[in-house]
């Protein structure tokens, strides 16, 4: 038999790691292996998540908490709780339906995930390009040429013929 110290609904007495077993006179049965209950008063235990294939275990399941997964090297997590693993690409690339593709001219990606984003248009902020952009890096904007009085800075402004953000190929 099972003794409890509660006059309430017997199920409210069941702590995390157990479930209120209606098939057995509402006793608090421990969660079976590979299942868990993270809060008290539960009528079932949830099945532990299994990190298989491209997923790997970051935190093991226990009777009171679910397993947590991350992704094997070469992949990264997407979605709440790492519900999906997506293939990594190199910096300067983005993942398409056909695989990893280089960023188009005028765009960059400085991570192994995500999409290529347009270079910053320095002229929109009234600035000039200090460092040209690449597939892997955004442009670096500097002060506008008008802000630079002679002798005030050693920075050489870029050639005026070039469009903002362009990188020599």
């Amino acid at each position: 038999f099972e003794r409890t110290r509660s006059l309430q609904d017997p199920c409210s007495n069941c702590p995390a790691g157990t479930f209120c077993d209606n098939n057995r006179n509402q006793i608090c049965s421990p969660c079976p292996p590979n299942s868990f209950s993270s809060a008290g008063g539960q009528r079932t235990c949830d099945i532990c998540r299994q990190c298989k294939g491209v997923f790997r275990t970051r935190k093991e399941c226990s009777s009171t908490s679910n397993a947590e997964c991350d992704c094997t090297p070469g992949f990264h997590c997407l979605g709440a709780g790492c519900s999906m693993c997506e293939q990594d690409c190199k910096q300067g690339q983005e993942l398409t339906k056909k695989g990893c593709k280089d960023c188009c001219f005028g765009t960059f990606n400085d991570q192994k995930r995500g999409i290529c984003r347009p270079w910053t248009n320095c002229s929109l902020d009234g600035k000039s390009v200090l460092v040209n952009g690449t597939k892997e890096r955004d442009v670096v904007c500097g002060p506008s040429p008008a802000d630079l009085s002679p002798g005030a800075s050693s920075v050489t402004p870029p050639a005026p013929a070039r469009e903002p953000g362009h990188s020599p190929q």
Epitope: E2, T4, N13, P15, G17, R24, S29, P32, P33, S63
Partner: antibody
């Protein structure tokens, strides 16, 4: 070192009481580790006495035959579990083992103490 | 829950295949453990969840079964395997953790 150490055994007269202790070291009792008591009379098999939830709740799981004579309790601050035995009889003479019932091992007893001897005799 | 083991004892030789059975009085799914005990020593967990080998246990030990009928098999008996073996239900509550009656394995 991960271990369980029982103490408190000895000789007691019929009708007497005894409290056994089981101190855990190297791990803490929790919702994943329930402390249990098992006994073995001389030349006989293993007999399950009961277990207590390893966390902060007082839920106990007891064998029917204990009939309230045996009570399991726990002191989390000392990481120790107790077996209070009352109205002892000659047939309670046995080696009493403390064991850890582990969720990770399908609630099997994956760690056992060395046992403490209880003799009920006048 | 009552657990009945058979045989209660058996004699065998090194290298023999040994099978011990355990029957539960009601279904316990796969919630069964097997232990080995040597004289004067505490039991040692061999198998849990009916068929999962405990850490450090040689692969010659295996378990099977579900529901009410379970089996422990030693594929090739070794000198250190002469001992008493117990099954235990790990189905908590209502006397759910009862041990089997034990099987003593001795040298033929």
């Amino acid at each position: 070192e991960v271990q369980l150490v029982e103490s408190g055994g000895g000789r007691v007269q019929p009708g007497g009481s005894l409290r056994l202790s089981c101190a855990a070291s190297g791990f803490s009792f929790s919702a994943n580790y329930y402390p249990c008591w098992v006994r073995q009379a001389p030349g006989k098999g293993l007999e399950w006495i009961g277990c207590i939830y390893g966390g902060s709740s007082d839920i106990t799981y007891d064998a029917q035959w204990t009939k309230g004579r045996f009570t399991i309790s726990r002191d989390n601050s000392k990481n120790t579990v107790y077996l209070q035995m009352n109205s002892l009889r000659a047939e309670d003479t046995a080696t009493y083992y403390c064991a850890r019932s582990a969720w990770y091992s399908g609630w099997g007893g994956d760690l056992w103490g060395q046992g403490t001897q209880v003799t009920v005799s006048s | 829950i009552q657990m009945t083991q058979s045989p209660s004892s058996l004699s065998a030789s090194v290298g023999d295949r040994v099978t011990i059975t355990c029957q539960a009085s009601q279904s316990i799914s796969n919630r069964l453990a097997w232990y080995q005990q040597k004289p004067g020593k505490a039991p040692k967990l061999l198998i849990y969840s009916a068929s999962t080998l405990a850490s450090g246990v040689p692969s010659r030990f295996s378990g099977s079964g579900s529901g009410t009928d379970f089996t422990l098999t030693i594929s090739s008996l070794q000198p250190e395997d002469f001992a008493t073996y117990y099954c235990q239900s790990t189905y908590y509550g209502n006397d759910g953790n009862a041990f089997g009656t034990g099987t003593k394995v001795t040298v033929l």
